[in-house]
């Protein structure tokens, strides 16, 4: 194939719920991805695998299968949701996320995503990693790109 470009756009929404007894935070994070097919033929996106890390610990994973077919010289925007759980050794975060005295409870999460396309039995994988701010204290919808966290660890595209 000539090339398939994958661009992680950002967090679209984050919906939060809590388990008071277990001091656990549940975050359903919906992300947006742009996949561009620069070939002169259609390409099949076989699967998208994603995981979310908080403080170097994987807190959520997701996999979407048989996603879509992208036409030549075309782009498709795909949303995918990763259910995450902040619990156990990270239960100290429960206090921060439920603290009433602060308005925004932003935490920094690392979003990893891998897009797999299959070409006559040969798989091609394209991966992206991005750090993003997510509010763990309330349900939030974001303007695309609004949640981006820029630091020296995150290479600029």
């Amino acid at each position: 194939p000539r090339s398939i470009d994958v661009k992680y756009i950002g967090v679209k929404s984050a919906y939060v719920s809590y388990d008071v007894q277990k001091r656990t935070i549940y975050l359903n994070i919906t992300n947006t991805l742009n996949i561009t097919n620069n070939n002169y033929y259609s390409v099949e996106v076989e699967n998208i695998t994603a995981q979310v890390q908080f403080s170097k610990t994987v807190i959520g994973k997701a996999r979407l299968n048989n996603i879509t077919i992208i036409g030549p010289l075309d782009m498709k925007q795909i949303d995918y949701t990763v259910p995450t759980v902040i619990a156990e050794e990270m239960s100290y975060m429960y206090d921060f996320c439920t603290l009433i005295s602060i308005k925004v409870h932003n935490i920094v999460l690392m979003m990893q995503v891998t897009v797999t396309t299959t070409y006559f039995g040969h798989s091609e994988q394209i991966s992206q990693e991005r750090y993003q701010y997510v509010d763990c204290g309330r349900n939030t919808t974001y303007q695309l790109g609004q949640s981006e966290y820029l630091n020296v660890l995150q290479p600029q595209q």
Epitope: V43, G71, P72, L73, D74
Partner: antibody
Framework: QVQLQQSGAELIRPGTSVKVSCKAS????????IEWVKQRPGQGLEWIGV????????NYNEKFKGKAKLTADKSSSTAYMQLSSLTSEDSAVYFC???????????????WGQGTSVTVSS | DIQMTQSPSSLSASLGERVSLTCRAS??????LNWLQQEPDGTIKRLIY???SLDSGVPKRFSGSRSGSDYSLTISSLESEDFVDYYC?????????FGGGTKLEIK
């Protein structure tokens, strides 16, 4: 039947621009690519670029970047090629060509327009 | 860019004769090759796609084949309307590139 009807011959002054049209009929315009090819008098064929009329996505031969601009109007099933800053080197016949494709397969240039002659002269 | 070297550039032959035109690719193009025919009035039509598949409506006297990086168009028995120009086209990579053409003339 599939037809690609191109606009008529053009006589253009150097330094100006021209827009060549290619009206498609007999098939679903957005289900195929449209490519453009140049042929100078008595010479061979040269690929300019390609457009997906459905998405508007384009790709150009490096040689024609900045020279050619490809567009398409879905409502009229018409593809356009604009050539700018014309010189005598741009005097040629320009063809629009339909290309079919599938998933991981391409069968390009199955139907050709009749060609549009562009002459650049002062 | 992939170079397509087409030979001969011109060929004189007689009616009923069998002729072959060749294109050599500078890089591997698999079976991604077309043969095109151009009439004196400029009209172009595709004869063969994917190296050896005949387009609908094209006479069976035309055939395409491959041997390594050499691609051939063969006309088994020349008819009067075959004395025109022929081009090969590779579409394995961008930019698409054409052979220099073969002018088929009547002897």
């Amino acid at each position: 039947q599939v037809q690609l009807q191109q606009s008529g011959a053009e006589l253009i002054r150097p330094g100006t621009s021209v827009k060549v049209s290619c009206k498609a009929s007999g098939y679903a315009f957005t289900d195929y690519l449209i490519e453009w090819v140049k042929q100078r008098p008595g010479q061979g064929l040269e690929w300019i670029g390609v457009i997906n009329p459905g998405s508007g996505g384009t790709n150009y031969n490096e040689k024609f970047k900045g020279k050619a601009k490809l567009t398409a109007d879905k409502s009229s099933s018409t593809a356009y090629m604009q050539l700018s800053s014309l010189t005598s080197e741009d005097s040629a016949v320009y063809f629009c060509v339909r290309s079919s494709y599938g998933v991981y397969v391409a069968y390009p240039m199955d139907y050709w327009g009749q060609g549009t002659s562009v002459t650049v002269s002062s | 860019d992939i170079q397509m070297t087409q030979s001969p550039s011109s060929l004189s032959a007689s009616l009923g004769e069998r002729v072959s035109l060749t294109c050599r690719a500078s890089q591997d193009i698999g079976s991604n090759l077309n043969w095109l025919q151009q009439e004196p009035d400029g009209t172009i039509k595709r004869l063969i796609y994917a190296t050896s598949s005949l387009d609908s409506g094209v006479p069976k006297r035309f055939s395409g084949s491959r041997s390594g990086s050499d691609y051939s168009l063969t006309i088994s028995s020349l008819e009067s309307e075959d004395f025109v120009d022929y081009y090969c086209l590779q579409y394995a990579s961008s930019p698409r590139t054409f052979g220099g053409g073969t002018k088929l003339e009547i002897k």
